[in-house]
């Protein structure tokens, strides 16, 4: 069920549960396994890191990608690997850490219209987009032509963050992906962990803005792993 999903996408400087109540026991929702958004339920605490087997990048955390652990290794055995930092070699965008993308085989810094991260993958589920007329019924197939003219504003349906205006990212919300504000300094963020399933992440926050990273709030270091509050902080 999704009872344990932490509904934390209200872009406000509020600790759970004030940021949302889906994480409360008795939250009135349930779902079939894999419903709507795959891959959000495979987190584990950083303190107890073990390689996590995967089939695709979406199954890994924001700071990871899915690949064979050894160069030229068995393609059938893939695990979540740490993302590659700027100027490191890459073969696809997902290999590069948030804020970067793969260009000519090297991870380079994203410009404002090319954010990436777990929430940036082209959505393969059956959800359309309505970024221009916003009537809810523009087709996905019209995306490329329309998006060159109009960038989605906050609340617009999107497929990827490049569909959204500057300062916004494309993040999941229920059965949709919509443009949400990129997080500012001090705002609560989601630090992705893999195991110890907390249900499907259907309430995504954006990533932290430029020059910020999602880190444990200093006064929460003593708290238990599960209750640590992460906020966007200066590098």
């Amino acid at each position: 069920t999704l009872n344990s999903v932490l509904n934390s996408n209200a872009i406000k400087n509020l600790p759970p549960p004030l940021g949302g109540a889906a994480g409360h026991p008795g939250s009135a929702v349930s779902a079939a396994p894999g419903i709507l958004y795959p891959g959000g339920n495979k987190y584990q605490t950083i303190d107890n890191y073990q390689p996590y087997p995967c089939a695709e990048d979406e199954e890994c955390g924001t700071d990871e990608y899915c690949a064979s652990p050894t160069r030229g290794g068995d393609a059938g055995v893939q695990i979540c690997l740490a993302c590659r930092k700027r100027r490191k070699r890459c073969m696809r965008h997902a290999m590069c850490c948030p804020g970067n993308y793969c260009k000519n085989g090297i991870c380079v810094s994203s410009d404002q219209n090319h954010f990436r991260g777990e929430i940036e993958e082209t959505i393969t589920e059956s959800f359309g987009n309505d970024h221009s007329t916003l009537d809810g019924y523009s087709r996905r197939t019209t995306l490329s032509s329309k998006m060159y003219h109009t960038k989605g504003q906050e609340g617009s349906v999107c497929l990827r963050s490049s569909d959204c205006a500057s300062g916004l990212c494309c993040a999941r919300h229920f059965w949709s992906k919509i443009c949400k504000p990129v997080l500012k300094e001090g705002q609560v963020c989601t630090k992705h962990r893999r195991k110890g399933s907390h249900g499907l992440e259907i309430f995504q926050r954006c990533y932290c803005g430029e020059g910020l990273s999602c880190r444990i709030q200093k006064d929460h270091h003593q708290a238990s792993n599960s209750s640590r509050l992460h906020t966007c902080q200066r590098h």
Epitope: G20, L36, S126, G136, S176
Partner: antibody
Framework: EVQLLQSAAEVKRPGESLRISCKTS????????MHWVRQMPGKELEWMGV????????SYNQKFKGHVTISADKSSSTAYLQWSSLKASDAAMYYC??????????WGQGTLVTVSS | EIVMTQSPPTLSLSPGERVTLSCRAS??????LNWYQQKPGQAPRLLIY???RLHSGIPARFSGSGSGTDFTLTISSLQPEDFAVYYC?????????FGQGTKLEIK
């Protein structure tokens, strides 16, 4: 133009089974999620659940889980809401709604279900 | 689940008047609020989504505002066709929930 055409009103007895339908046209059925919403006489709207017609995945409001089943047939671009055993309290107007965003943009005209012994 | 409370339950006004309908959420829902209009014997119709975005085909006299827990739907100048029941809906937390509605009737 998006159109959602729901099946006709039904009069049933408690304990009977029922399946109501929502036939869609004007868009690609598998590209949008389909929701069912209940409205009891003189009451507010209640979200029952959602289906992704492309793969049959469903998510229910806990209040309705186990009592109703949402399904979809891609070949006929039709969504269904069904009960295996109706209760008197199931008497209501039922709407289907097709959408892309976290809002309900297009609605069927509604199917009135009467349950009376 | 999040409880949505609308006020007042009924409002009697004349065409041409400005009206403000209120909706309160039991907890912070950010901007995840939609407004619908329902006329007798008809299905609801989406007016406003994401707090203030006007749905296509909806007249500009409708507008939405607010944030957090308190939201308003404003109709700048009531037209005869605007008399109906208005529902707010939160889509911040599953399950999406609706308010009990505000009935707008002709004075």
């Amino acid at each position: 133009e998006v159109q959602l055409l729901q099946s006709a009103a039904e009069v049933k007895r408690p304990g009977e089974s029922l399946r109501i339908s929502c036939k869609t046209s004007g868009y690609t059925f598998t590209e949008y999620t389909m929701h069912w919403v209940r409205q009891m006489p003189g009451k507010e709207l209640e979200w029952m659940g959602v289906i992704d017609p492309s793969n049959g995945d469903t998510s229910y409001n806990q209040k309705f889980k186990g009592h109703v089943t949402i399904s979809a047939d891609k070949s006929s671009s039709t969504a269904y809401l069904q009960w295996s055993s109706l209760k008197a309290s199931d008497a209501a107007m039922y709407y289907c709604s097709s959408t892309t965003g976290p809002w309900f943009a297009s609605w069927g005209q509604g199917t009135l279900v009467t349950v009376s012994s | 689940e999040i409880v949505m409370t609308q006020s007042p339950p009924t409002l009697s006004l004349s065409p041409g008047e400005r009206v403000t309908l209120s909706c309160r959420a039991s907890q912070d829902i950010s901007n995840y609020l939609n407004w619908y209009q329902q006329k007798p014997g008809q299905a609801p119709r989406l007016l406003i989504y994401y707090k203030s975005r006007l749905h296509s085909g909806i007249p500009a006299r409708f507008s939405g505002s607010g944030s957090g827990t308190d939201f308003t739907l404003t109709i700048s100048s009531l037209q005869p066709e605007d008399f109906a029941v208005y529902y707010c809906q939160q889509v911040h937390t599953l399950p999406p929930t609706f308010g009990q509605g505000t009935k707008l009737e002709i004075k």
